[in-house]
């Protein structure tokens, strides 16, 4: 058993059919010795009498607010919440696996340049009795800060029968460099509770794997004299870093027919324009990447060939 | 080339070359096989190759006050992983490909690096640790190590050759 | 699927020599190292040496000047030949796939069902 | 070499219960956090049976009922639910250096 935060706690279940549980022992929070009785969430029964109880968690049943009371008067408040192990494993119920890039992906994160400002988001199918707390540090043996906001609900989805709900958490490190090489990973770290239950879940990367520029901006087409080219310009998104000469990013030049099937023209550039035919009822899309570090590309920006 | 003693080196050649091996190390990273030990690990791997950090001016206001601190950092990174992929790490058991571009990554590797410093003038280097891989399974998961590593600091090596090429040339 | 298989003389006189051949289907010898075990009645495994994809070769430094493993990678066989067998060399010998190197970090995945020799006069 | 020791060397448990086995390294076993330790189950007449590899992942076709933890030196081998298919011997191995080696086994028995 360990303390999530005052007055809360989680205890760690081996769960499997008759399993033992865990003997935990609850001390009420006073300087009273005499007459104090136990009770749990809204029950009036009385669990047990004097400072301590102690108690055998074995179930969701055996969680929830525990409460010593003296004469009527509340003295105070544990909440034991359970973190569930089954076959070597902690459960992972409250979030959904996002399967990308792997499976097991429970959390995601972005970042659009490498100020050290970054968001992670996660799926869940619970609409209730929901809660989330989010930590992050640089390294983990010996950690330098990273501040996160709260998780906020950031979209819902419907899918299938089921509502698919969005959560999302901005961080910012503390003291970002940009320039530097990378060598001790960020690590995200969100506690789940979802009624009597807790779960954790964990991040590692680098801000330089998780870069994902926004699209280029300002995409404009101009024609060329006596020809079916077009001079395709565009300028490096605002949210990149700058300055541009040490932050380069390289693009993609794409001609898309109308319809999917027809054949793509790709023109790859590290300039801000580009020459290319454009037929008719085609768009022309660009997008951006790290010039010298394979992480995604950004988003096309598009714009209609006429 | 660089000439020792604070004057610039050829910041375009440079440009060139370490946009080249961006390009080489990620072009190597998914042949060096099969790997799913990959995504596991630890922290203590990165301990052992040397980083471009942050004092290390290897910023666009560094470079500009004094460009040689990032260049002599550069250049000691370059000399330890070239010393890195010509090692049993790579050389031993399992055999890489006959066209794996590890052979082009190693000798683009030792290109940058005579670049910046020509014959006759010696920045100290960084001792490789002795990472004693015994086994291929430990060879391999070095592999992986070491070429993610390397496109992390060739990224940061090419950043600062672009800049210096665009805004510090003479 | 996946197949090791050996075959040995079974019986073999104090101070002679054991050829065991060991054939395997399912996967090619370029691609995976093999290992020999051997097991004594009613004992527990004892790791013999390993030839790699490449050809190379690790042994036990305790019977290592008594082993030698080899291969035929267009036959798909491997080979062990051990020399100066006493009655303690009785045992159960296994060939053994080593699981991908990128994956399984030296555990065997595949195991034959092994031959049996006994060292006796 | 690298001692690997088993215990305990039997263990009788009923059916429905937890089996716990534990394997303890003379050296540890990990290689830049990857633990080359690996359990196998080995039924009387038939060659061991790799269950799990790399401390905790379960081998393709074993029931999830069998799990692995562990790290460096300590490791433990843990079947839920014991069903009388798992009366087997278990044995430990690591692969982080020469010789590879293995544990003397722990037998497991039905109570």
């Known amino acids: 058993i360990w303390e999530l935060k005052k007055d809360v706690y989680v205890v760690e279940l081996d769960w499997y059919p008759d399993a033992p549980g865990e003997m935990v022992v609850l001390t009420c929070d006073t300087p009273e010795e005499d007459g104090i009785t136990w009770t749990l969430d809204q029950s009036s029964e009385v669990l047990g009498s004097g400072k301590t109880l102690t108690i055998q968690v074995k179930e969701f049943g055996d969680a929830g607010q525990y409460t010593c009371h003296k004469g009527g008067e509340v003295l105070s408040h544990s909440l034991l919440l359970l973190h569930k192990k089954e076959d070597g494993i902690w459960s992972t119920d409250i979030l959904k696996d996002q399967k990308e890039p792997k499976n097991k992906t429970f959390l995601r994160c972005e970042a659009k340049n490498y100020s050290g400002r970054f968001t992670c988001w996660w799926l869940t199918t619970i609409s209730t009795d929901l809660t989330f707390s989010v930590k992050s540090s640089r390294g983990s043996s010996d950690p330098q800060g990273v501040t996160c906001g709260a998780a906020t609900l950031s979209a819902e989805r419907v899918r299938g029968d089921n509502k698919e709900y969005e959560y999302s958490v901005e961080c910012q490190e503390d003291s970002a460099c940009p320039a530097a090489e990378e060598s001790l990973p960020i690590e995200v770290m969100v506690d789940a509770v979802h009624k009597l239950k807790y779960e954790n879940y964990t991040s590692s990367f680098f801000i330089r794997d998780i870069i994902k520029p926004d699209p280029p901006k300002n995409l404009q087409l101009k024609p060329l004299k006596n020809s079916r080219q077009v001079e395709v310009s565009w300028e490096y998104p605002d949210t990149w870093s700058t300055p541009h000469s040490y932050f380069s990013l390289t693009f993609c030049v794409q001609v898309q027919g109308k319809s999917k099937r027809e054949k793509k023209d790709r023109v790859f550039t590290d300039k801000t324009s580009a020459t290319v035919i454009c037929r008719k009822n085609a768009s022309i899309s660009v997008r951006a990447q790290d010039r010298y570090y394979s992480s995604s590309w950004s988003e096309w920006a598009s714009v209609p060939c006429s | 080339r660089a000439v020792p003693g604070g004057s610039s080196p050829a910041w375009t050649q440079c440009q060139q070359l370490s946009q080249k091996l961006c390009t080489l190390a990620w072009s190597a990273h998914p042949l060096v096989g099969h790997m799913d030990l990959r995504e596991e690990g630890d922290e203590e791997t990165t301990n052992d190759v040397p980083h471009i950090q942050c004092g290390d001016g290897c910023d666009p206001q560094g470079l500009r006050d004094n460009s040689q601190f990032c260049l002599q950092r550069i250049h000691q990174g370059l000399i330890f992983y070239e010393k890195l992929l010509g090692s049993d790490i790579f050389t031993g058991e399992p055999s890489l490909l006959p066209d794996s571009p590890v052979g082009q990554l190693h000798a683009s590797l030792l290109g940058l690096s005579q670049l910046l410093q020509p014959e006759g003038h010696h920045w100290e280097t960084q001792q490789i640790p002795s990472l004693s891989p015994s086994q291929p399974w430990q060879r391999l998961l070095l592999r992986f190590k070491i070429l993610r590593s390397l496109q992390a600091f060739v990224a940061v090596a090419a950043r600062v050759f672009a800049h210096g090429a665009a805004t510090l040339s003479p | 699927q996946v197949q090791l298989k050996e075959s040995g003389p079974g019986l073999v006189a104090p101070s002679q020599s054991l050829s065991i051949t060991c054939t395997v289907s399912?996967?090619?010898?370029?691609?995976?190292?093999i290992s020999w075990v051997r097991q004594p009645p009613g004992k527990g495994l004892e790791w013999l040496g390993v030839?790699?994809?490449?050809?190379?070769?690790n042994y036990n430094s305790g019977i290592k000047s008594r082993l030698t493993i080899s291969k035929d990678n267009s036959k798909s066989q491997v080979f062990l030949n051990m020399n100066s067998l006493q009655t303690e060399d009785t045992a159960r010998y296994y060939c053994?796939?080593?699981?991908?190197?990128?994956?399984?970090?030296?555990?065997?995945?595949?195991w034959g069902q092994g031959t049996s020799v006994t060292v006796s006069s | 070499d690298i001692v690997l020791t088993q215990s305990p060397a039997s263990l009788a448990v009923s059916l429905g219960q937890r089996a716990t086995i534990s394997c303890r390294a003379s050296?540890?076993?990990?290689?830049?956090?990857?633990?080359?330790m690996h359990w196998f189950q080995q039924k009387p007449g038939q060659p061991p049976k790799l269950l799990i590899y790399?401390?905790?992942n379960l081998e393709s076709g074993i029931p999830a009922r069998f799990s692995g933890s562990g790290s460096r030196t300590d490791f433990t081998l843990t079947i839920n639910r014991v069903e009388t298919d798992d009366v087997a011997t278990y044995y430990c191995?690591?692969?982080?250096?020469?010789?590879?080696?293995f544990g003397g086994g722990t037998k497991l028995e039905i109570k």
């Open positions: 030839i790699w994809t490449g050809g190379g070769t």
């Open positions: 790399r401390a905790s």
């Open positions: 053994v796939r080593e699981g991908d190197y990128g994956s399984y970090a030296g555990a065997m995945d595949y």
């Open positions: 399912g996967f090619s010898l370029t691609s995976y190292a």
């Open positions: 191995q690591q692969a982080n250096k020469d010789p590879y080696t």
């Open positions: 050296e540890s076993v990990d290689y830049y956090g990857i633990s080359s």
